[in-house]
Amino acid sequence: MRTEAQVPALQPPEPGLEGAMGHRTLVLPWVLLTLCVTAGTPEVWVQVRMEATELSSFTIRCGFLGSGSISLVTVSWGGPNGAGGTTLAVLHPERGIRQWAPARQARWETQSSISLILEGSGASSPCANTTFCCKFASFPEGSWEACGSLPPSSDPGLSAPPTPAPILRADLAGILGVSGVLLFGCVYLLHLLRRHKHRPAPRLQPSRTSPQAPRARAWAPSQASQAALHVPYATINTSCRPATLDTAHPHGGPSWWASLPTHAAHRPQGPAAWASTPIPARGSFVSVENGLYAQAGERPPHTGPGLTLFPDPRGPRAMEGPLGVR
């Protein structure tokens, strides 16, 4: 889900072209371009699997691909947490793990991935068209949420491929500050470049000064916040609603997958770092114009049962309010 790019070195404009403006137009665009290109964006993936042995049993795996430290993970069903979804489990990396029926076992698989086993009978049983969402709160990135469900035709025992979740939800609380600066900077940079369109512009050449310039990732936080303002909520229509079961569920028990590599907690070093994991690792670019997502060199991804987009337009205080009337 990442692209790599060399950050071009901006050559100084020829003397006398800009006069007093020369230094400003030299330094500012370079700084802003560096900020725009190097701004990293975390990603969340979700995998939902129905067990062959028990058709009412589901396993959800979620992971966070980012460099920040995870402060809380929330797993919900029926939609995103705070948008009609019901919390199934809350996992804190140090304080503990809590889960509620029909969740049977929530656990950390690595420092940046979790799994949750659900089971039930009758009304409390999950069904194939249920949407499951994982929300990762991290510092400094903020909160990121991805949702997934089993494809309608999936056979028991098989899993939906992990949703790569280009950027599925960004709570503005975590990113608005940095995003605002970057967004303004990028817009200003574009404005400067546009102004130079009909003038002799500085030549862009590959950098010779550093062996490798910073990596560029497909979505800067500024773009994420832009998307959050423009992409509407996707509505979930599920016929399977959770039911309450007053049951205690002890933790522990075997994991049904090999754990992801421990480097999942760190910023992955390009696509190769994830080659051994089930997460698709292909370069992509996410376009937020008209609220559409477009893969670089591909058709726009189908957001169908396995992928749901949930930007949060409610602003930084969206999580406040009595008892989850958030």
Epitope: T74, W100, A101, W108, D246, H249, P250, H251, E320, R326
Partner: antibody, heavy 114, light 113 residues
């Protein structure tokens, strides 16, 4: 910071039932998942259970199943614990606390006496 | 259920002294996935509710003085107060935060000479 305000002391007769409340005023998601803890006089703490405001689902310590019922009213931001068939063994201070026990109510003293 | 055993049951120390108290669990509180220990320490002063001091075996809750230090892993844990102050007079409880039911130890009563 979240505030948990519990209802006042209760004096009830054996065999009766009682309902204790805990009003949460917080600003983060986890502030509204409430634990209940019992502390008998001069004794340690016992976890009774927790309640999920999204589903009103609860987890219980097996020891308190049938004794305690945990519910929550999302609209008012209040969690409740009902205790039934009270005996002198139920006389204690009952606390509510947030999901990971980082904030506690002031406690409600329950006295069961004939 | 996980049984939490604290020792000693009481301590009598002078202000300025270093004090340690122990907590042992009947099962490991280490989460193998993220290598974190789910153990918490609480301080309860007379007539007050418990107050979270330490979580994750060693992480101080915000606002807790740095004279309080948690350590240990698996089944054996220690709370250390590097230089006891008069206001530290309290009961100290450890808690299994790993699995339900979330059991507490019997407590260590800290008394100041």
């Amino acid at each position: 910071e979240v505030q948990l305000q519990q209802s006042g002391p209760e004096v009830v007769k054996p065999g009766a039932s009682v309902r204790i409340s805990c009003k949460a005023s917080g600003n983060t998601f986890t502030d509204f998942f409430i634990n209940w803890v019992k502390q008998s006089h001069g004794k340690s703490l016992e976890w009774i259970g927790d309640v999920n405001p999204d589903s009103n689902g609860a987890n219980y310590n097996q020891k308190f199943k049938g004794k305690a019922t945990l519910t929550v009213d999302k609209s008012s931001g209040t969690a409740f614990m009902g205790l039934r068939s009270l005996t002198s063994e139920d006389s204690a201070v009952y606390y509510c606390a947030t999901l990971f026990f980082d904030n506690w109510g002031q406690g409600t003293t329950l006295t069961v006496s004939s | 259920d996980i049984v939490m055993t604290q020792s000693p049951s009481s301590l009598n120390v002078s202000a300025g002294e270093k004090v340690t108290m122990s907590c042992k669990s009947s099962q490991s509180l280490l989460n193998s996935g993220n290598q974190k220990n789910y153990l918490a320490w609480y301080q309860q002063k007379p007539g007050q509710p418990p107050k979270l001091l330490i979580y994750g075996a060693s992480t101080r809750e915000s606002g807790v003085p740095d004279r309080f230090t948690g350590s240990g892993s698996g089944t054996d844990f220690i709370l250390t107060i590097s230089s006891v102050q008069a206001e530290d007079l309290a009961l100290y409880y450890c808690q299994n935060a790993h699995s339900s039911p979330y059991t507490f130890g019997g407590g260590t009563k800290l008394e100041i000479k």
